[in-house]
Amino acid sequence: HTVELNDMFGQIQSPGYPDSYPSDSEVTWNITVPDGFRIKLYFMHFNLESSYLCEYDYVKVETEDQVLATFCGRETTDTEQTPGQEVVLSPGSFMSITFRSDFSNEERFTGFDAHYMAVDVDECKEREDEELSCDHYCHNYIGGYYCSCRFGYILHTDNRTCRVECSDNLFTQRTGVITSPDFPNPYPKSSECLYTIELEEGFMVNLQFEDIFDIEDHPEVPCPYDYIKIKVGPKVLGPFCGEKAPEPINTQSHSVLILFHSDNSGENRGWRLSYRAAGNECPELQPPVHGKIEPSQAKYSFKDQVLISCDTGYKVLKDNVEMDTFQIECLKDGTWSNKIPTCKIVDCRAPGELEHGLVTFSTRNNLTTYKSEIRYSCQEPYYKMLNNITGIYTCSAQGVWMNKVLGRSLPTCLPECGQPSRSLPSLVKRIIGGRNAEPGLFPWQALIVVEDTSRVPNDKWFGSGALLSESWILTAAHVLRSQRRDTTVIPVSKEHVTVYLGLHDVRDKSGAVNSSAARVVLHPDFNIQNYNHDIALVQLQEPVPLGPHVMPVCLPRLEPEGPSPHMLGLVAGWGISNPNVTVDEIISSGTRTLSDVLQYVKLPVVPHAECKTSYESRSGNYSVTENMFCAGYYEGGKDTCLGDSGGAFVILDDLSQRWVVQGLVSWGGPEECGSKQVYGVYTKVSNYVDWVWEQMGSPQGRAPGGTVS
C-alpha cells in the first residue's frame, strides 16, 4: 500500500518495527514538501535480508523520474548497499520510498527506522542555468529566492532579468554622443531603448558609429535577439547587430529615431555613436574697420553666430543705434541674418554743466570723441574746486568724461569764504559815530527782516546775519525768536522771514538778492533770560549766486578759547548809528531800518574777566558765560547797537588771510550803545562750529567755503 506524507519532517519504519518485518510485503511512502525545499532522508537502523543486487528485500528511494538509491542487507558489500551514515537528498520537493520483502526470509530481520526532513534549497548557489538564474543580484530565503537589480535598472516582469528605462532620450544639441546603456559594460537585457535626435529644421544629422560595436547576433538569422534600428521619417535603416559597426549614415533629416532592443539573455558590450549636425554654409565675413569678428572661422554654417565688436574707443553702430557688440547668425538658407555694422568712434558729447564753473576744451575743434580732453574750472574768485583737483577730464572708451580722481563725477565748486573782492581798510571808524561801508566790503552781510503777519497789526523787526554758504545764514537766536513770548523760545515762522544779501543801501533793494527762508533753526539751548547760546541758522529757499557783493564768511576752528584779547575785529550793520536817538524817535521811525547805508566799526576783543567784572558791577542780573565774549572800548564811543543783532564780528585769520566769523552781535548793557565801559557782548561762534556743520549737513573742516583750515 502507499502512504502519502506532506509534513516538513517525519519518521518511516518497516512494518512491525522493531520486530521483524513480514514476508511478501510492499509499502510505498510518498513524501511531498513545498517548492523551494528538498527532502533529506537518513536511517537510524537498517537490517534487511542480503541478496545480490538487492533482489530479495530492499528499500528503494526515488523521485518522479530517477532512482536515488537502493538499499538491502546489514552492511555494504560489493553487490549490495546499506545506507549506513549516508544521507539521501532529493533534487526536488518529492521523494518516494518503497519497502519490499520477498516470500521467504531464512532469518528474522528487524527492518529499518528512517527519518526525513525538508531542507531549504539555496537557489542562488544552485541555479547555474542563465535562463533561470538572476541577472544581477540573487537573494535566498527559506523556501524560495528573489532577484533584484543594480542602481538604475528595473526588474523585468520575468522577475529575473534586469532592464533599463531608456525610452525617453532627447538630443537637441548640434553634436552629441549616444551609447547603449552602461557602455562599454554589457548592456542590460530585456530593454527597449529609444533615442531621439531632434534639431532645428535646416540641419541634417550625420551618424558615425565608433570602433567598439558588439550586439548579440545569430549565424544564420539576421539579428533575431538584439539589434539597432534607425528611423528617419518613414524610412527604417537596419536592423544592425554583430561585431561590425555600420558605415557612417547621412540621414538628410533634422529628426532621427534610434531604436535599440535587447532580449533576456547574452552578455555583449554594446555600441557608441557620435552625431553631428550639418547645415548650409554662409559667405565669408570681413570685420568692420576698427572692429573684429568672433569666433574667427574659415567656414560658417547654419546656426553659427558671430559677435562683432569694436576696438577700444569705438562703438558698434547699427541703424543709428550705438551698442557694445552686435550678433549675426547664419540662416538655414545660407545667408547672414544681418549686414556687418560699422565701428564708430565713441563720442562723450557735450560735457555736463558745472554749477559755478565753466569748461574749456583742450582738444582742437572742441572735439568730444574718444581720448579728447576738457578742463573744468570754478568761477574764481568766488568759487574754488573741492580738494584742489586738476579738473581735467578725458573722453573714455565707455563714452563718459572721466577724471583720474573723481571718475565720472563732476567736480564741486565750493564758495570761497572770507575773501571780499574789496580789501577791508585797516583804519575804520565806527557804527556809532558812523562810517559808511563801501559795497563789497562785507559781502557776507545779510539783512534779516522778520514780519509776523499773523498778528494785527503786523510785528516787524530786523537784524543782521552772515552768509556761510550759498544756502545758509548764521545769525543770533534772539533775532529769530517769536517776540510775543515772555520766557518761552519759539522760532518765528519761516514764512515771516526775508533775507537780503548784497545789500548796501536799504533804500535801494533792487540790486540785492532777496530770499525767503526754507528753515529757521534756533540753538536748542538758547536761554531768553541770559542770552546764552544766542545762535541760529536760516536755510534759504534757493541757493544764492555768489559774486563781488555776495560771498560767504569763514567759520572758525573749533576752539573754546575764542578770539584772543585785544585782537581787532570788524562789525557791520544797519542799526542805530546815532547814540542820541531817543526811544520815541526809534518808535516814530516805524519799521524802517535805522541806518540807510551799511555801517561798520573796528573793535578790540575785551579780556573775558574784565568784561565779566564790568557787567557784574551793574544792577541787574547780567551773565557773561563761556559762550560769549566782549568787544569795545573802555572809553566808549564805538559800538554795535540795536538792529545790528546777529551781525558777524569778523577777524582776519593770519594763516589763511581769510575773514572769520568769531562773534555774533548778541546783547549789551542797559545804558545807551557806545557808553563808557559798556562792552558789546557777542556769541562765541568757535564753540558752535560742530553744531553749525551738523545743521547744515556738511562735513566739518572742509575748505574753501567753510572752516578756515
Epitope: 499773523s454 497789526p457 510785528d459 534772539h478 540795536l642
Partner: antibody
Framework: QVQLVQSGAEVKKPGASVKVSCKAS????????IEWVRQAPGQGLEWMGE????????DYNERFKDRVTFTADTSTSTVYMELSSLRSEDTAVYYC??????WGQGTLVTVSS | DIVMTQSPDSLAVSLGERATINCKSS????????????LAWFQQKPGQSPKLLIY???TRESGVPDRFSGSGSGTDFTLTISSLQAEDVAVYYC????????FGGGTKVEIK
C-alpha cells in the same frame, strides 16, 4: 466785508460741554491768529487762548488748559472753541477776536442746573 | 503771568474835560527788538463787543477820533481822552500782548 460771526446763545447743564463757532470772512483766514476772550456778567475781560488756523498752533491760558480745545476748519473758515466740564461760573459771553482788532458779536453761554 | 493793574476803577468827568486812565504792568512791555511796547487799549460800550482804540501803547487804530491818545513805555501807560464826549461813556480796558495775554480790570468812564 471783514467780519467774525459767532454761533447763537447756549444753555447747558453743569458737567456738560459747549462748542462755540466763529466764522471768518473778508480776509485770509489761515494766516491770522484767532483769540478767545470771555466776559462773565458785570465782570472784566479774560483771555482764554488763541489758535493759528493755517498751522493749527495753539496757546492756552493755564487756567483753562485742561478744559478748553480750539480747532479750525479751513474749508469753511471757521474756528471752534469747546469748553468741557461746565460749571455755573463759566456763564459768560464768549468772544472770538482776530488778533485784537476785530471782535465777534459774542456768544452767551449759560450754565444752569 | 504778567499782571495788569488799572486805575481808577471808575471815573466821572464833565463833557469836554480830559479823562486820564492809568495802566501798570508787573513786567516791562517794551520789546527792544521790535522797538514796540506790547500794550493795547479797548473801549466797551454797554451791550457791545470791545473795540480796539490804541495799539503799541501809542498808535491809534484807524477810524478812532484823535481825542484818544496813548502814552508810556516799559511798565507805566496812560490812555487820555482830551475832551470827553457823551459817546465816550464806556468801560476801558488795557491789555498786554505777551503770551499769555492779560487784561486790566477795566475803568468805567461816566459823565459828571
Amino acid at each position: 466785508q471783514v467780519q467774525l460771526v459767532q454761533s447763537g446763545a447756549e444753555v447747558k447743564k453743569p458737567g456738560a460741554s459747549v462748542k462755540v463757532s466763529c466764522k471768518a470772512s473778508g480776509y485770509t483766514f489761515t494766516g491770522k491768529w484767532i483769540e478767545w476772550v470771555r466776559q462773565a456778567p458785570g465782570q472784566g475781560l479774560e483771555w482764554m487762548g488763541e489758535i493759528l488756523p493755517g498751522s493749527g498752533s495753539t496757546d492756552y491760558n493755564e487756567r483753562f488748559k485742561d478744559r478748553v480745545t480750539f480747532t479750525a476748519d479751513t474749508s469753511t473758515s471757521t474756528v471752534y472753541m469747546e469748553l468741557s466740564s461746565l460749571r455755573s461760573e463759566d456763564t459768560a459771553v464768549y468772544y472770538c477776536v482776530r488778533s485784537e482788532d476785530l471782535w465777534g458779536q459774542g456768544t452767551l453761554v449759560t450754565v444752569s442746573s | 503771568d504778567i499782571v495788569m493793574t488799572q486805575s481808577p476803577d471808575s471815573l466821572a468827568v464833565s463833557l469836554g474835560e480830559r479823562a486820564t486812565i492809568n495802566c501798570k504792568s508787573s513786567q516791562n512791555l517794551f520789546n527792544s527788538r521790535t522797538r514796540k511796547n506790547y500794550l493795547a487799549w479797548f473801549q466797551q460800550k454797554p451791550g457791545q463787543s470791545p473795540k480796539l482804540l490804541i495799539y503799541w501803547a501809542s498808535t491809534r487804530e484807524s477810524g478812532v477820533p484823535d481825542r484818544f491818545s496813548g502814552s508810556g513805555s516799559g511798565t507805566d501807560f496812560t490812555l487820555t481822552i482830551s475832551s470827553l464826549q457823551a459817546e465816550d461813556v464806556a468801560v476801558y480796558y488795557c491789555k498786554q500782548s505777551y503770551i499769555p495775554f492779560t487784561f486790566g480790570g477795566g475803568t468805567k468812564v461816566e459823565i459828571k
